[in-house]
């Protein structure tokens, strides 16, 4: 896991003899600077491994290195979801898991990481140069997607360590909007600071923050966020054509994903169709996902992937026993 940089607490200098306007002019840069310094970029890592025991079996592990609550994870292959990629599994923290052949087993490993075992022979079998992508929708960051594939010369049973994958996409509506505001803020801040440098400095009481504090961590996007800037979207063509969902066998029956058409993965719809919409606060989350969750209740009974989940017509809380466990 990535170690986190500890950001020093930045405090605006005391107003001293400055007037109200001067005070406001001074506070704004500090607020913007704090935003610039602390604006961490979420990352997604993907690890793909071929099992030594079964050469047609792959294990995909993905993790999210953001601070928000994960609201949906979509795993696809053959390229990013919605760009020719085929959905293999959808994992929701309260609605459970949905998977399609050749996905054998999708599971949450921790609150921020998932794993998926793929197996197959014939048409639906993955092959060594297949690209696998994981998309994490989170609040408030939006959606982040990373892709990875087996290293070309990897031996069965071996894999590259899980690192942030080279292909990372932030959904424009959610992330780039925020990034744009921050970028504008940072540019404006630099402009203000430069302008401030050429003015006689007002007499200020000494700041409680050391002079080095603002420089403690220059705001630079991480490798993954640079990938997001330089490769806003990438489609990978693989010589291995994954099976379409038309031939895939759902793991369970009708449930919260009941409205998903079987051909959804070939078009930007289905499990990830709503993800380019800015993610609202959790309270209104379901309304964004209506295409995916149809008329399902707020949560189905706790069943494993092999069991059928039926939406309860009586409404969101109708299916619950104590704390939702029946």
């Amino acid at each position: 896991m990535r170690t986190e940089a500890q950001v020093p607490a930045l405090q605006p200098p005391e107003p001293g003899l400055e007037g109200a306007m001067g005070h406001r002019t001074l506070v704004l840069p500090w607020v913007l600077l704090t935003l610039c310094v602390t604006a961490g970029t979420p990352e997604v890592w993907v690890q793909v491994r071929m099992e030594a025991t079964e050469l047609s079996s792959f294990t995909i592990r993905c993790g999210f290195l953001g601070s928000g609550s994960i609201s949906l994870v979509t795993v696809s292959w053959g390229g990013p979801n919605g760009a020719g990629g085929t959905t293999l599994a959808v994992l929701h923290p309260e609605r459970g898991i949905r998977q399609w052949a050749p996905a054998r087993q999708a599971r949450w490993e921790t609150q921020s990481s998932i794993s998926l075992i793929l197996e197959g022979s014939g048409a639906s079998s993955p092959c060594a140069n297949t690209t696998f992508c994981c998309k994490f929708a989170s609040f408030p960051e939006g959606s982040w997607e990373a892709c990875g594939s087996l290293p070309p010369s990897s031996d069965p049973g071996l894999s590259a360590p899980p690192t942030p994958a080279p292909i990372l996409r932030a959904d424009l509506a959610g992330i780039l909007g925020v990034s744009g505001v921050l970028l504008f803020g940072c540019v404006y801040l630099l402009h203000l600071l430069r302008r401030h440098k050429h003015r006689p400095a007002p007499r200020l009481q000494p700041s409680r923050t050391s002079p080095q504090a603002p420089r403690a961590r220059a705001w630079a996007p991480s490798q993954a966020s640079q990938a997001a800037l330089h490769v806003p979207y990438a489609t990978i063509n693989t010589s291995c054509r994954p099976a379409t969902l038309d031939t895939a066998h759902p793991h369970g029956g009708p449930s919260w994903w009941a409205s998903l058409p079987t051909h959804a993965a070939h078009r930007p719809q289905g499990p990830a169709a709503w993800a380019s919409t800015p993610i609202p606060a959790r309270g209104s989350f379901v309304s964004v996902e209506n295409g995916l969750y149809a008329q399902a209740g707020e949560r189905p009974p706790h069943t494993g992937p092999g069991l059928t989940l039926f939406p309860d017509p009586r409404g969101p809380r109708a299916m619950e026993g104590p704390l939702g466990v029946r």
Partner: antibody, heavy 118, light 107 residues
Framework: EVQLQQSGAELVKPGASVRLSCTAS????????IHWVKQRPEQGLDWIGK????????EYDPKFQGRATMTTDTSSNTAYLQLSSLTSEDTAVYYC???????????WGAGTTVTVFS | SIVMTQTPKFLLVSAGDRVAITCKAS??????VVWYQQKPGQSPKLLIY???SRYTGVPDRFTGSGYGTDFTFTISTVQAEDLALYFC?????????FGGGTKLEIK
């Protein structure tokens, strides 16, 4: 209904071993991880470890490594915890719980009380 | 392993009071913290996951907050049925570790 049914209370002598069982109904244990948690009287909880019933791979807290052994039998949808070389410190309630279908322990067994007495 | 230090160990409150329980991790666990409630003679039940996401069906008087190393669980208006043991769990890194627990008693 999704449930984890645990075996009955055990009364054992110091130095002995005990095997606890946890049988799942309403879901297949192959689709989740099974974790074991220890709770001593009037104390907090200790994570013993987890097992992946699909392949038998397990992971333990170093505190329990060597004395605890987790196994599963997918044909009977049952997970087992074996504790050896028991001491009075092992007197506790042992819970099995599932993780993986959701990113938290959503279903717990009722617990098995193990009492080590001289 | 990561140590989760939970305070206080005991809370004696009256119905209607507001209570806060804290868990401090010995290193960052990001938001991978869960809060459970365990009533006497029962198995634990999930209240909060992702440090601040309230589980479906959990009354909104229960809230969680925090990120990194400092986490707080709050009951805004304690009710008689909230008498229980509350504990946090981190699943950020293995071995997973629990807080020592807070026993809430009603006057």
């Amino acid at each position: 209904e999704v449930q984890l049914q645990q075996s009955g209370a055990e009364l054992v002598k110091p130095g002995a071993s005990v095997r606890l069982s946890c049988t799942a109904s309403g879901f297949s244990i192959r689709d989740t991880y099974i974790h074991w948690v220890k709770q001593r009287p009037e104390q907090g909880l200790d994570w013993i470890g987890k097992i992946d019933p699909a392949n038998g791979k397990s992971e333990y807290d170093p505190k329990f490594q060597g004395r605890a052994t987790m196994t599963t039998d997918t044909s009977s949808n049952t997970a087992y915890l074996q504790l050896s070389s028991l001491t009075s410190e092992d007197t506790a309630v042992y819970y099995c719980t599932r993780y993986g279908y959701y990113p938290y322990f959503d279903v717990w067994g009722a617990g098995t009380t193990v009492t080590v007495f001289s | 392993s990561i140590v989760m230090t939970q305070t206080p160990k005991f809370l004696l409150v009256s119905a209607g009071d507001r209570v806060a329980i804290t868990c401090k991790a010995s290193q960052s666990v990001r938001h991978d913290v869960v809060w459970y409630q365990q009533k006497p003679g029962q198995s634990p039940k999930l209240l909060i996951y992702y440090a601040s996401s309230r589980y479906t069906g959990v009354p909104d008087r229960f809230t969680g907050s925090g990120y990194g190393t400092d986490f707080t669980f709050t009951i805004s208006t304690v009710q008689a049925e909230d008498l229980a043991l509350y504990f946090c769990l981190q699943d950020f890194s293995s071995p997973w570790t629990f807080g020592g627990g807070t026993k809430l008693e009603i006057k």
